[in-house]
């Protein structure tokens, strides 16, 4: 009778992660008597995948009943495939022997390749906020994909970016891979509503790329512009001075009025108006009792925005030149409010 051959008809099998792999194997004869075993890899370090008679292999099932008389189909199914299962699988026939069974004949092997989807890209920006005209770096990471080929693109508000560097690790053969990319983005004053998008395309995604986003509102700081103006007299001996704080982001802002360098009042921006570009405006006003001053008054609006060093704008109030106006003689006071309460 012809000597037994072990036939593995599939040279390679491609399976998606999470699916079941079927590895086919048939023998051409029932002789010699002995079990079939499946291994991943060859040589002394090979890994036992299935032994039909003993051991624990919860992920493996046989395609046919191996104990049926005259069965020569030794195909197996491996469930819940992960990238770690990739490799070459050998169906090996053993001959019963003493003390141990002896390897008799091996199949040619079936290479199992696993396609695994990349994880959702995670985009992270700089730890500290930056101001317009500065360049900031964003990183994008995705893990666990196989095969290694992958495409990564960066966008800002739908416009593709070109200033980025990408690495896929490891460089050599691996069960799965990771991608890491760093993009440089120049901030503009209009970027409060902007988004940076990292897009990853891979064979497992069937043309539907994964995206990770970062909002530039988390990254940008737009410093305010200040304007101090003197309003017409509201009452006898009183001058209304306003400080317009324009186009700032984020909202965290504290304003201090100084009269001739002395703190008059401090307030925190509360009811602000939002501009179309996402920045904020706010206004504070101060009633100055002119009669309390003999000399000219230097009024300073000092603003501390988002924990940054204070910026200020001053206005010189000429006491001597101030005309008197008819009207009720209210008590001299310093009051402040936001835009809503001026009129």
């Amino acid at each position: 009778e012809e000597e037994l051959q072990v036939i593995q008809p599939d040279k390679s099998v491609l399976v998606a992660a999470g699916e079941t792999a079927t590895l086919r194997c048939t023998a051409t004869s029932l002789i010699p008597v002995g079990p079939i075993q499946w291994f991943r890899g060859a040589g002394p370090g090979r890994e036992l995948i299935y032994n039909q008679k003993e051991g624990h292999f919860p992920r493996v099932t046989t395609v046919s009943d191996l104990t049926k008389r005259n069965n020569m189909d030794f195909s197996i199914r491996i469930g819940n495939i992960t990238p770690a299962d990739a490799g070459t699988y050998y169906c090996v026939k053993f001959r019963k022997g003493s003390p141990d069974d002896v390897e008799f004949k091996s199949g040619a092997g079936t290479e199992l390749s696993v396609r695994a989807k990349p994880s959702a890209p995670v985009v992270s920006g700089p730890a500290a906020r930056a101001t317009p005209q500065h360049t900031v770096s964003f990183t994008c990471e995705s893990h666990g994909f196989s095969p290694r080929d992958i495409t990564l693109k960066w966008f800002k508000n739908g416009n593709e970016l070109s200033d980025f560097q990408t690495n896929v690790d490891p460089v050599g053969e691996s069960v799965s891979y990771s991608i890491h990319s760093t993009a440089k983005v120049v901030l503009t004053r209009e970027d409060v509503h902007s988004q940076v998008i990292c897009e990853v395309a891979h064979v497992t995604l069937q043309g539907d790329p994964l995206r990770g986003t970062a909002n530039l509102s988390e990254t940008i700081r737009v410093p305010p512009t200040l304007e101090v103006t003197q309003q017409p007299v509201r009452a006898e001996n009183q001058v209304n001075v306003t400080c317009q704080v324009r186009k700032f982001y984020p909202q965290r802002l504290q304003l201090t009025w100084l009269e001739n360098g002395n703190v008059s009042r401090t307030e925190t921006a509360s009811t602000v108006t939002e501009n179309k570009d996402g920045t904020y405006n706010w206004m504070s006003w101060l009633l100055v009792n002119v009669s309390a001053h003999r000399d000219d008054v230097k009024l300073t609006c000092q603003v501390e925005h988002d924990g940054q060093p204070a910026v200020s704008k001053s206005h010189d109030l000429k006491v001597s030149a101030h005309p008197k106006e008819q009207g009720s003689n209210t008590a001299a006071e310093n009051t402040g409010s936001n835009e809503r309460n001026i009129y």
Epitope: K53, E54, G55, T67, K96
Partner: antibody, heavy 113, light 108 residues
């Protein structure tokens, strides 16, 4: 559900023979090797041997070779372990196990004069 | 015959502590054929870890196994009261199959 149910405790005199049974359910006994393991009181596990019920091929540990016989009856899905020329040091719990993964509850054999 | 030597013979620890149990083989054992069993008094052994590092069904993730060649380890990251038992390593790489003498993990 895989189950291995062993026969009850035995008390034997030195020189006697004991035969323990292990009836299995939830699988066909022909599909797996059936192993036997000894555990003397307060001691560790010791592998005795195994049978391939499909063709009755057996392997035994050198320590038990010549005194132990493992058999199987595929019609009743039962494995047996027979130990002869009993001595006091054979006093132990004997376990059957299916392919190293599932174990019977154990059978206590006491050898005493 | 491959002799498996487990150390220590007894390990006294408190719940919450990390336990490291060792199993040393007199000659090389393929990692596929190295199993660990847990046994409690009056009970049959239970398969705990198979093929060196794979947890049997229902075994908590605080257990892990590692090793290759002649040196294998079972680790419990943070001991729970139910983990105190005897643990045996077992090789079925070549006949006669052998067990280690066991490590008794007891409450300190």
């Amino acid at each position: 559900e895989v189950q291995l149910v062993q026969s009850g405790a035995e008390v034997k005199k030195p020189g006697a023979t004991v035969k323990i049974s292990c009836k299995v359910s939830g699988f066909n006994i022909k599909d797996y090797y059936m192993h036997w393991v000894q555990q003397a009181p307060g001691k560790g596990l010791e592998w005795i041997g195994r049978i391939d019920p499909e063709d009755a091929e057996t392997k035994y540990a050198p320590k038990f070779q010549g005194r132990v016989t493992i058999t199987a009856d595929t019609s009743t899905n039962t494995a047996y372990m027979e130990l002869s020329s009993l001595r006091s040091e054979d006093t132990a719990v004997y376990y059957c196990d299916r392919g190293l993964a599932y174990w019977g509850q154990g059978t206590l054999v006491t050898v005493s004069s | 015959e491959i002799v498996l030597t487990q150390s220590p013979a007894t390990l006294s620890l408190s719940p919450g502590e990390r336990a490291t149990l060792s199993c040393s083989a007199s000659s090389s054992v393929s990692s596929s054929y190295l199993y660990w069993y847990q046994q409690k008094p009056g009970q049959a052994p239970k398969l705990w870890i198979y093929s060196t590092s794979n947890l049997a069904s229902g075994i908590p993730a605080r257990f892990s196994g590692s090793g290759s060649g002649t040196d294998y380890t079972l680790t419990i990251s943070s001991l729970e009261p139910e983990d105190f038992a005897v643990y045996y390593c077992h090789q079925w790489s070549s006949y006669p199959y052998t067990f280690g003498q066991g490590t008794k993990l007891e409450i300190k």
